[in-house]
């Protein structure tokens, strides 16, 4: 809608790991920045947001369809990870250095 | 995209060229089946949406606050190509038999 | 700065035709959705018709075959032709800015014209 | 079609007072949705646009939360000049729908 700020973006998100239950196994970090893809993808689709070639199809076809088809979503296209201290099966505390997928690098419509 | 009800899975989005203003340089088809990926990301995220831990993290975060947090969305996680007969940048037809990332092979939540 | 004009209100008998206009200045036209919202007296907002800067249009089922919706972006109007109209197409007709060029938030409004249909 | 269901449809409140209304939408609409003001016999003005961002030019007293179905426009400080209609409006796509409005009236 109105204004670059509402096309698809990467956004602040802080998570504390308390409001998700995963306090229970992750002794630390307490919270952690995991970012969200948020804001529309809106034609035309930009360079910044990598559209797929199906994206960019059914950008264009929503544009005929609205009510048929829906738009791309903005969702995240790469992932980076974050070093935890968790309780392992025994209970314990272990390092793991790149606990994978955990933030967002990139977004995307797709 | 998103839907109302329903959980993510691969629809059928059959598109005509012509709809999308590409039959000036696609000569065949004239359509196709690009699917479509429908349907929400409900907790809990089931195997065969394949989620990312992110997508995790986001939909559980979404549980506690919901008007702050976004679901995640259920999109194409893996394309396949389509063979088409296309004018090339002197206007010859050409085939192109592998035309890469126009049709959803898998949808996820991400 | 942005200025949406609207003309062409009045009133009209049930069955009969009419055209609204919609002069915009203070941005490129071209580039933004333009939409027709209506307000019945005494009621909410009606959204009625959009035509986005692709090109694209649609309408609102209660108009569907009967309203058309056009633009001429060499003269910055926006048009609404209303054919077959009915008593309840009785409203203040605005025009509105999308702030984008497809469906968004109607960051600019013009002031209405009164369409009345009664015999 | 997407509907659009405001609530309160009325509500009376006093200058300074904290002002709260709601939106929900019969699907989800991640946050393609919009706050407008109308005075009688004027245009709507729009307030926040995305469900969260403040339109220029408009007071900071309003603010805008909500994802998904449900929104949420307050009002931290009620002024005289806020006394009028409010509705909201999806722009998730086409057709753009309204909320029915809510009117603050002085109690």
């Known amino acids: 809608s109105t204004g670059a700020g509402s096309h698809c973006q990467k956004t602040s998100l802080r998570v504390n790991f308390e409001d998700i239950g995963w306090n229970s196994w992750i002794i630390a970090p307490k919270e952690y920045e995991a970012y969200e893809c948020k804001g529309g993808c809106f034609f035309p689709l930009a360079d910044d947001v990598t559209p797929t070639k199906h994206a960019i199809v059914q950008t264009l076809v929503h544009l005929k369809f609205p009510t048929k088809v829906g738009k791309a979503c903005c969702v995240p296209t790469k992932l980076s990870p974050i070093s935890i201290l968790y309780k392992d099966d025994m209970g314990v505390p272990t390092l793991k250095y790149h606990y994978e997928g955990m933030s967002v690098a990139e977004c995307g419509c797709r | 995209s998103t839907g109302a009800g329903s959980h993510c899975q691969k629809t059928s989005l059959r598109v005509n060229f012509e709809d999308i203003g590409w039959n000036s340089w696609i000569i065949a088809p004239k359509e196709y089946e690009a699917y479509e990926c429908k349907g929400g990301c409900f907790f809990p995220l089931a195997d065969d949406v394949t989620p990312t831990k992110h997508a995790i993290v986001q939909t559980l975060v979404h549980l506690k606050f919901p008007t702050k947090v976004g679901k995640a969305c259920c999109v194409p996680t893996k394309l396949s190509p389509i063979s088409i007969l296309y004018k090339d940048d002197m206007g010859v037809p050409t085939l192109k038999y592998h035309y890469e990332g126009m049709s959803v092979a898998e949808c996820g939540c991400r | 700065q942005v200025q949406l004009l609207e003309s062409g209100g009045g009133l009209v008998q049930p069955g009969g035709s009419l055209r609204l206009s919609c002069a915009a200045s203070?941005?490129?036209?071209?580039?933004?959705?333009m939409s027709w919202v209506r307000q019945a007296p005494g009621k909410g907002l009606e959204w009625v018709s959009i035509?986005?800067?692709?090109?694209?249009?649609h309408y609102a089922d209660s108009v569907k075959g009967r309203f058309t919706i056009s633009r001429d972006n060499s003269k910055n109007t926006l048009y609404l032709q209303m054919n077959s109209l009915r008593a309840e197409d009785t409203a203040v007709y605005y025009c509105?800015?999308?702030?984008?060029?497809?469906?968004?938030?109607?960051?600019?409004w013009g002031q209405g014209t009164l369409v009345t249909v009664s015999s | 079609d997407i509907q659009m269901t405001q609530s309160p449809s009325s509500l009376s409140a006093s200058v300074g007072d904290r002002v709260t209304i709601t939106c929900r939408a019969s699907?989800?609409?991640?946050?393609?949705l919009n706050w407008y003001q109308q005075k009688p016999g004027k245009a709507p003005k729009l307030l926040i646009y995305?469900?969260?961002n403040l339109q220029s030019g408009v007071p900071s007293r309003f603010s805008g939360s909500g994802s998904g179905t449900d929104f949420t426009l307050t009002i931290s400080s009620l002024q005289p000049e806020d006394f009028a209609t409010y509705y909201c409006?999806?722009?998730?796509?086409?057709?753009?729908?309204f909320g029915q409005g809510t009117k603050v009236e002085i109690k």
């Open positions: 035509t986005l800067g692709t090109g694209h249009t």
């Open positions: 699907q989800d609409i991640r946050s393609y």
């Open positions: 995305d469900a969260s």
């Open positions: 409006q999806q722009s998730d796509t086409s057709p753009l729908t």
């Open positions: 509105a800015r999308g702030s984008y060029i497809i469906w968004s938030a109607l960051d600019y």
């Open positions: 203070g941005f490129t036209f071209s580039s933004y959705a």
